[in-house]
């Protein structure tokens, strides 16, 4: 037997206790599929989050981060502070990469320079805090 609630489209919800009546989602709530028993409250992008896509009756809002921050986690669940290239974020804030490591992005950690000799190559261009070494032809 088909569930009568399956006739309720996205943007509505269906209450079993009310003979499967479809009701429109109230403002600031949504149902992204048909046959849903409730509408979900729209996500609000506040503080360090900003709205990338407005909520609608059929889809949730999507957030990203204000300038100086970047998204982390599924669906941008967190915003993390940006650092400069050549730095990484620690518990004490942005710190320069240690000698022998680099970071060419505003996020993430400092990574070791490539060891050219492991591939039997020589260093063509020295590494910096912001850039990896460039390996050249074999010595």
């Amino acid at each position: 037997l088909q569930d009568p609630c399956s006739n309720c489209p996205a943007g509505t919800f269906c209450d079993n206790n009310r003979n499967q009546i479809c009701s429109p989602c109230p403002p600031n709530s949504f149902s992204s599929a048909g046959g849903q028993r409730t509408c979900d409250i729209c996500r609000q992008c506040k503080g360090v989050f900003r709205t990338r896509k407005e909520c609608s009756s059929t889809s949730n809002a999507e957030c990203d981060c204000t300038p100086g921050f970047h998204c982390l986690g599924a669906g941008c669940s967190m915003c993390e502070q940006d650092c400069k290239q050549g730095q990484e974020l620690t518990k004490k804030g942005c710190k320069d990469c240690c000698f022998g490591t680099f970071n060419d992005q505003k996020r993430g950690i400092c990574r070791p320079w490539t060891n050219c000799s492991l591939d039997g190559k020589s260093v063509l261009v020295n590494g910096t805090k912001e850039r990896d070494v460039v390996c050249g032809p074999s010595p």
Partner: antibody, heavy 114, light 107 residues
Framework: EVQLVESGGGLVKPGGSRKLSCAAS????????MHWVRQAPDKGLKWVAY????????YYADTVKGRFTISRDNAKNTLFLQMTSLRSEDTAMYYC???????WGQGTTLTVSS | NIVMTQSPKSMSMSVGERVTLSCKAS??????VSWYQQKPEKSPKLLIY???NRYTGVPDRFTGSGSATDFTLTISSVQAEDLADYHC?????????FGAGTKLELK
């Protein structure tokens, strides 16, 4: 800014037909169900019809069932109300509203009179 | 169909007074009631949804309350710009239905 702009109203003879349009902007039209609501002169608001975001589900008020047809063109961000067999009691200001019923257009006036 | 009955039909108030408008549903509509303000020659504007949630940008002098069948819109200190018709409506089930409205006038 959310905007809904109705058009197509005017004077129609009883038994005649008319098609109203509602042009939407400032929001993702294809993600919202839409309503038509009307208001007779110096009267309250009366819901007319609803269409779901994709157009697959449609509801009508009993007073217009079989005479009015609600439709939408998501590519053109436009809602329609095709009205046939018009009666004097259909005379009203016709508003479109999105399904949260939070934004309404400015309305278009339909007068059915001989 | 669910019938929404508003009272009074009209009321005259002075600026600064507290206003209470009533809306009764013919059957239980949970908290699925909204209040709209409609100024002359204008379209309705949403004030309150879900019986008690103030919509974005609505001044906090407007408060909604109630559930099931009895609902109230209160204006704590009425202002000249609040002169308008006020409609309640239910979205508990189709067909959506509205009250006949209450006209708020200034003394």
């Amino acid at each position: 800014e959310v905007q809904l702009v109705e058009s197509g109203g005017g004077l129609v003879k009883p038994g005649g037909s008319r098609k109203l349009s509602c042009a939407a902007s400032g929001f993702t039209f294809s993600e919202f169900g839409m309503h038509w609501v009307r208001q007779a002169p110096d009267k309250g608001l009366k819901w007319v019809a609803y269409i779901s975001s994709g157009g697959s589900t449609i509801y009508y008020a009993d007073t217009v069932k079989g005479r009015f047809t609600i439709s939408r063109d998501n590519a053109k961000n436009t809602l329609f109300l095709q009205m046939t067999s018009l009666r004097s009691e259909d005379t009203a200001m016709y508003y479109c509203a999105r399904d949260w019923v939070d934004y309404w257009g400015q309305g278009t006036t339909l007068t059915v009179s001989s | 169909n669910i019938v929404m009955t508003q009272s009074p039909k009209s009321m005259s108030m002075s600026v600064g007074e507290r206003v209470t408008l009533s809306c009764k549903a013919s059957e239980n509509v949970g908290s699925y009631v909204s209040w709209y303000q409609q100024k002359p020659e204008k379209s309705p504007k949403l004030l309150i949804y879900g019986a008690s949630n103030r919509y974005t940008g609505v001044p906090d002098r407007f408060t909604g309350s109630g559930s099931a069948t009895d609902f109230t819109l209160t204006i704590s200190s009425v202002q000249a710009e609040d002169l308008a018709d006020y409609h309640c409506g239910q979205s508990y089930s189709y067909p959506l239905t509205f009250g006949a409205g209450t006209k708020l006038e200034l003394k």
